[in-house]
């Protein structure tokens, strides 16, 4: 499917002191959706500032956000999910800045979980598996996953593999023997919905065997 912006591109804000960005999460709490917005400048004095969303809503014209420390948050079933909503920063009744946003283009999936790695001695490979709550969802079901792994001593030398399933095989010969590895995974919408990368899953650590050394399941460290 063609799109206009790369996945992960933030909506650009108006050039003023109240620039903000938002992300949506669909069916994040049962059938409830959420929308989270925050100012891009952490030094903005948010004391009297409120957020409001209007348009592309079911049964209501507008909804107000709740303030949770530095973020603004809505949890609701009332997103129409078609058409553009107008999200405004307000002081009282006055709008300081607004953005037209289609909530289906700013979706941030939930982080994958239960990441694990199993060594298969006979096949000389590692089977990486993980889980995602999106397998049970009705809207954002199709994701692209980014599995990243590195040798623990190579701080910034991550190898990335993109896949659409929740299972990946790493060949032993592609990894250093007797080395400690860190692996993690994140997800991004991949069919119709667009948006941002999820948070990373918790990292999993595993050690590769010595050459010709047999080993069973990789134990987490």
């Amino acid at each position: 499917e063609s799109g206009y912006a790369q996945n992960g591109d933030l909506e650009d804000a108006e050039l003023d002191d109240y620039s903000f960005s938002c992300y949506s999460q669909l069916e994040v709490n049962g059938s409830q959706h959420s929308l989270t917005c925050a100012f891009e400048d952490p030094d903005v004095n948010i004391t009297n500032l409120e957020f409001e969303i209007c348009g592309a809503l079911v049964e209501v014209k507008c909804l107000n956000f709740r303030k949770l420390q530095e973020i603004y948050f809505i949890e609701t079933k009332k997103f129409l999910l078609i058409g553009k909503s107008n999200i405004c920063v307000k002081v009282g009744e006055k709008s300081l800045t607004c953005k037209k946003i289609d909530l289906t283009t700013i979706v941030k999936p939930e982080a994958p979980f239960d990441l694990s790695v199993v060594y298969r001695e006979g096949a000389n490979d590692f089977v990486v598996t993980f889980n995602t709550s999106h397998l049970q969802k009705k809207y954002v079901k199709v994701l692209m996953h980014d599995v990243a792994y590195r040798q623990e001593k190579d701080e910034n030398k991550w190898t990335h593999v993109n896949l659409s399933s929740t299972k990946l095989t790493l060949l032993q010969r592609k990894l250093q023997p007797a080395a400690m590895y860190e692996i993690k995974v994140r997800s991004i919408p991949d069919h119709y919905f667009k948006g941002f990368w999820s948070e990373w899953s918790p990292s999993y650590y595993f050690r590769t065997p010595e050459i010709n050394n047999s080993s069973g399941e990789m134990d987490p460290i």
Epitope: E1, D12, I82, G83, K84, T105, K138, Y139, Y192
Partner: antibody
């Protein structure tokens, strides 16, 4: 009020190019993507492609890739559609249309007739 | 490409009666309750006009005698009651997958 005003009718020879403009008014230009839809004489509607005036990013119907180039000018709130290597089959009314959501068209220009004839 | 088949190709309706147009798609254009089907009216010499978006949402300013329904691969546009000014061509359009395709159109005439 929200309006899309297109440039006037064009008559072109086969092999030539044509550039049709669509000027938006009555709303913030960068808030909505603009698309082009063509309608050959007595025929139905065919989506050609769209452009996001905010980023300049484009999306094309594969059928029209290489044939159509979409551009936008934020300073004048105008989008352009250039058709190259014109053939008689390109004779049609070309509409620009605003995308109210993904991807339906809530505001339409009046249409520009392009006639390709030797 | 997703193919949209409209039926009937044309119909004649008396004022005050109901007109029903169907649009069938070659694959589903729904994601759960999000139905990516839209309807337009086009009168001779004019651009199309959006009537219904998301299968059943009435566009602002469109008379309530127009309504839409359906999901997955089968959608319906209903005009009830039909008025003389509803003489036009009607098109369905899907937006789940590029290229965004239209149906072949249904010509509605008022008897």
């Amino acid at each position: 009020q929200v309006q899309l005003v297109q440039s006037g009718a064009e008559v072109k020879k086969p092999g030539a190019s044509v550039k049709v403009s669509c000027k938006a008014s009555g709303y913030r230009f960068t808030d909505y993507e603009l698309h082009w839809v063509r309608q050959a004489p007595g025929q139905g509607l065919e989506w050609m492609g769209g452009i996001d005036p905010k980023t300049g990013g484009t999306a094309y119907n594969q059928k029209f890739k290489g044939k159509v180039t979409l551009t936008s000018d934020r300073s004048t709130s105008t989008v352009y559609m250039e058709l190259s290597s014109l053939r008689s089959e390109d004779t049609a009314v070309y509409y620009c249309a605003r995308s109210g959501g993904r991807w339906y068209f809530d505001v339409w220009g009046q249409g520009t007739t392009v006639t390709v004839s030797s | 490409d997703i193919v949209l088949t409209q039926s009937p190709a044309s119909l004649a309706v008396s004022p005050g009666q109901r007109a029903t147009i169907t649009c069938r798609t070659s694959e589903s254009v729904s994601i759960h309750l999000l139905h990516l089907m839209h309807w337009y009216q086009q009168k001779p010499g004019q651009p199309p006009k959006l009537l219904i978006y998301g299968a059943s949402n009435l566009e602002s300013g469109v008379p309530a005698r127009f309504s839409g329904s359906g999901s997955e691969t089968d959608f319906t546009l209903t005009i009830n009651p039909v008025e003389a000014e509803d003489t036009a061509n009607y098109y369905c359009q899907q937006s789940i997958k590029d290229p965004y395709t239209f149906g072949g159109g249904t010509k509605v005439e008022i008897k």
